[in-house]
């Protein structure tokens, strides 16, 4: 049902990485526009992206208010140029999104190795603590601030001269590993949230190798 030539949105999909969260949907509009509403399970609906011809809406500002809440969005379809018009039941056509809980579902972005420093036979590898758009007391929180000990990093490291990898874990953003003196090593890290059932792991960081500019060596 609905007004002539107006179709309901479909394939509503949450795209979220490190809490940057966009709702996407289809179809590309032909003679129609969309408005999005978002709500927590117990809250009021808030309208966003009014009468847009886009098929995406950035809802980050809403979800970062409480990343542990579960959100629902809906996309309303209106005839272009006649946004007051409603469907046959007296309401505009709309479609609901799947529920979305940012803390449990946002994808972990690709991490970055900030630095590594060798002191004798030890190397300290530091992972960049990426800033998110989640705020507390008017400051942006880092990924570690948000997830705390729920977030771990896995380090993969190997001698530049061989293919055999080793691994280590940390629930901070730093690794201290043993290496053979005089050998160059390469490093890659991955973020993991062990308690999750979906979107548990990030992709691996870019590989960084000793002898390149991010590193520092001290006897």
């Amino acid at each position: 049902s609905g007004t002539t030539n107006t179709v309901a949105a479909y394939n509503l999909t949450w795209k979220s990485t490190n809490f940057k969260t966009i709702l996407e949907w289809e179809p590309k509009p032909v003679n129609q526009v969309y408005t999005v509403q978002i709500s927590t399970k117990s809250g009021d609906w808030k309208s966003k992206c009014f009468y847009t011809t886009d098929t995406e809406c950035d809802l980050t500002d809403e979800i970062v208010k409480d990343v542990k809440q579960t959100y629902l969005a809906r996309v309303f379809s209106y005839p272009a140029g006649n946004v007051e018009s409603t469907g046959s039941a007296g309401e505009p056509l709309y479609e609901n999104s799947p529920e979305f809980t940012p803390y449990l579902e946002t994808n972990l972005g690709q991490p970055t190795i900030q630095s590594f420093e060798q002191v004798g036979t030890k190397v300290n590898v530091t992972v960049e603590d990426e800033r998110t758009l989640v705020r507390r007391n008017n400051t942006f929180l880092s990924l570690r601030d948000v997830f705390g000990k729920d977030l771990i990093y896995t380090l993969y490291y190997w001698k530049s001269s061989s293919s055999g990898k080793k691994t280590a874990k940390t629930n901070t953003n730093e690794f201290l590993i043993d290496v053979d003196k005089g050998e160059n090593y390469c490093f890659s890290v991955q973020a993991v949230i062990p308690s999750r059932t979906v979107n548990r792991k990030s992709t691996d960081s870019p590989v960084e190798c000793m002898g390149q500019e991010k590193g520092e060596f001290r006897e």
Partner: antibody, heavy 117, light 107 residues
Framework: EVQLVESGGGLVQPGGSLRLSCAAS????????MHWVRQAPGKGLEWVGL????????IYDPKFQDRATISADNSKNTAYLQMNSLRAEDTAVYYC??????????HGQGTLVTVSS | DIQMTQSPSSLSASVGDRVTITCRAS??????LNWYQQKPGKAWKVLIY???SLAEGVPSRFSGSGSGTDYTLTISSLQPEDFATYYC?????????AGQGTKVEIK
């Protein structure tokens, strides 16, 4: 329901090879790390290695580095262990296990590999 | 590689006894230490992870403590179903290594 089913064990001649399979159901192996662990008769648990099926990273216990290859076919939701140059002391039950990154939460019933002439 | 030394290798106890098993790592493993239980001919299952966290569905009579290199599994009041072999595992760095196991038998 999460299930891991190992297969491919049996009697192998010393110096021979085998390929064990670990078919997973009830979850996507790409979301986890998959390990191989073995237990010789009457002995303790011994770690062989792991794979991150999504990224393809593999890590081995150095004692198996030259003889073991762990792989995964994500389209079949299956992990594999290839072991070469087998010797009598490789006789064991081989288990695959799912690792959350905090602990092994599921593993299979194991498949017995006997190396004997 | 990190060596895990578990003791005792076996112990005899009675139902209702308090049982303590220890595991020592050859260097600091930062609480990346899990305890598993294995019954004869059966699967092994996680009891404790991150040294002190009780796994889902595990009775509260099991507890874990320790940090650095020294860790302990305690069964506050041994039950008939607890007669089994217990293993500690470190998973902070590769290769993952296990203790030799502690077999808990009926006295």
């Amino acid at each position: 329901e999460v299930q891991l089913v190992e297969s491919g064990g049996g009697l192998v001649q010393p110096g021979g090879s085998l390929r064990l399979s670990c078919a997973a159901s009830g979850f996507n192996i790409k979301e986890y790390y998959m390990h191989w662990v073995r237990q010789a008769p009457g002995k303790g648990l011994e770690w062989v290695g792991l794979i991150d099926p999504e990224q393809g990273n593999t890590i081995y216990d150095p004692k198996f580095q030259d003889r073991a290859t762990i792989s995964a076919d994500n389209s079949k939701n299956t992990a594999y262990l290839q072991m070469n140059s087998l010797r009598a002391e490789d006789t064991a039950v081989y288990y695959c296990a799912r690792d959350t990154a905090a602990y092994f939460d599921y593993h299979g019933q194991g498949t017995l590999v006997t190396v004997s002439s | 590689d990190i060596q895990m030394t578990q003791s005792p290798s076996s112990l005899s106890a009675s139902v209702g006894d308090r049982v303590t098993i220890t595991c020592r790592a050859s260097r600091d493993i930062k609480s990346y230490l899990n305890w598993y239980q294995q019954k004869p001919g059966k699967a092994w299952k996680v009891l404790i992870y991150y040294a002190t966290s009780l796994a889902e569905g595990v009775p509260s009579r099991f507890s874990g403590s320790g940090s650095g290199t020294d860790y302990t599994l305690t069964i506050s009041s041994l039950q008939p179903e607890d007669f089994a072999t217990y293993y500690c595992w470190q998973h902070g760095e590769s290769p993952w290594t296990a203790g030799q196991g502690t077999k808990v038998e009926i006295k």
